[in-house]
């Protein structure tokens, strides 16, 4: 199980109307450019076999991948939202830096790897899809970690 005290984010992180709105606006703008509506990255398959106490740890992995492999490489797009949302998400990632799991996390890594593989397989359109799901990432992170 995770060291649960470290796998927590204060509710106040998600109670900032301005940055919440900007995150959702960024997701909306990117989703308009997403022509692959059959695939959903953040959905049931991602959380399959993951207990309530492990959800935040899983979402930390998804957040870190999204920042490093999607948002940073695409940082010049979807302005002005991107320049505000990326630092906000990076702060959340930093606050979860001490969130670790005790014992086997293979099932979590397997689920996250499938998401990574899907994004990579789709190429740039996979990255756009990931940005288009930032609203789901935001909400899932909130629901899993507060």
């Amino acid at each position: 199980a995770p060291i649960s005290s470290h796998c927590r984010l204060d509710k106040s992180n998600f109670q900032q109307p301005y940055i919440t709105n900007r995150t959702f606006m960024l997701a909306k703008e990117a989703s308009l450019a997403d022509n692959n509506t059959d695939v959903r990255l953040i959905g049931e398959k991602l959380f399959h076999g993951v207990s309530m106490s492990e959800r935040c740890y899983l979402m930390k992995q998804v957040l870190n991948f999204t920042l490093e492999e999607v948002l940073f490489p695409q940082s010049d797009r979807f302005q002005p939202y991107m320049q505000e949302v990326v630092p906000f998400l990076a702060r959340l990632s930093n606050r979860l830096s001490t969130c670790h799991i005790e014992g086997d996390d293979l099932h979590i890594q397997r689920n996250v790897q499938k998401l990574k593989d899907t994004v990579k397989k789709l190429g740039e359109s996979g990255e756009i899809k990931a940005i288009g799901e930032l609203d789901l990432l935001f909400m899932s992170l909130r629901n899993a970690c507060i």
Partner: antibody
């Protein structure tokens, strides 16, 4: 095909106990949490409790102490043990699968089993 | 614990009508809201989650909207099989787990 079938309902006297079963097929209890919900005659839905993938349990505040959820993964069955039953516990009891998609959603549901508490 | 207030509690409508049901939460629940349909003597069936995402197999005449405290379920053109009771349901995280899941009181859609 995913199926949930409740059983064990019936007539019980006030103060009595009853154990309901929810037999599942088409998925594994080691991959999904399961919830119990009840519905009094002509009334709305009321959440009772949940058993997580790791067998942790959480209950509605009113259900704590009298209601216990457990499972037997080898039998693919979830149980609801109800003690010190009262007339107001008369209801149809449903089990449902909890699909977490970033938020908890309950799908599908069993057909329900009727519990009547009366002398 | 969050309280979900549905309105109206019942309504009469005809086949082909546009029907709107509202659900108001006593606190901000973001988009953590689902809608269920229940026919007499049957179990509830998931219609919508994330406030606006249609569940698999649900006809496109059903739609959901809203966030925060005010939510709406709309049936664009009522069909005979849509006469049922509809429930909203919220998930509230971060508080005690004993009040995580809450249902609204229901809205019964009857034939006019």
């Amino acid at each position: 095909e995913v199926q949930l079938v409740e059983s064990g309902g019936g007539l019980v006297q006030p103060g009595g106990s009853l154990r309901l079963s929810c037999a599942v097929s088409g998925f594994s209890l080691s991959s999904y949490a399961m919830i119990w919900v009840r519905q009094a005659p002509g009334k709305g839905l009321e959440w009772i409790g949940i058993i997580d993938i790791d067998a942790s349990t959480y209950y509605a505040s009113w259900a704590k102490g009298r209601f216990t959820i457990s499972r037997d993964s080898s039998k693919n069955t979830v149980y609801l043990q109800m003690n010190s039953l009262r007339a107001e516990d008369t209801a149809v009891y449903y089990c449902a699968r909890d699909r977490f998609v970033g938020v908890d959603i309950f799908d599908p549901w069993g057909q329900g089993t009727l519990v009547t508490v009366s002398s | 614990a969050v309280v979900l207030t549905q309105s109206p509690s019942s309504l009469s409508a005809s086949v082909g009508d546009r029907v709107t049901i509202t659900c108001q939460a006593s606190e901000d629940i973001y988009t953590n809201l689902a809608w269920y349909q229940q026919k007499p003597g049957k179990a509830p069936k998931l219609l919508i989650y994330w406030a606006s995402t249609l569940a698999s197999g649900v006809p496109s005449r059903f739609s959901g909207s809203g966030s925060g405290t005010d939510f709406t379920l709309t049936i664009s053109s009522l069909q005979p099989e849509d006469f049922a009771t509809y429930y909203c349901q919220a998930c509230v995280y971060g508080n005690s787990a004993d009040s995580r899941y809450t249902f609204g009181g229901g809205t019964k859609v009857e034939i006019k």
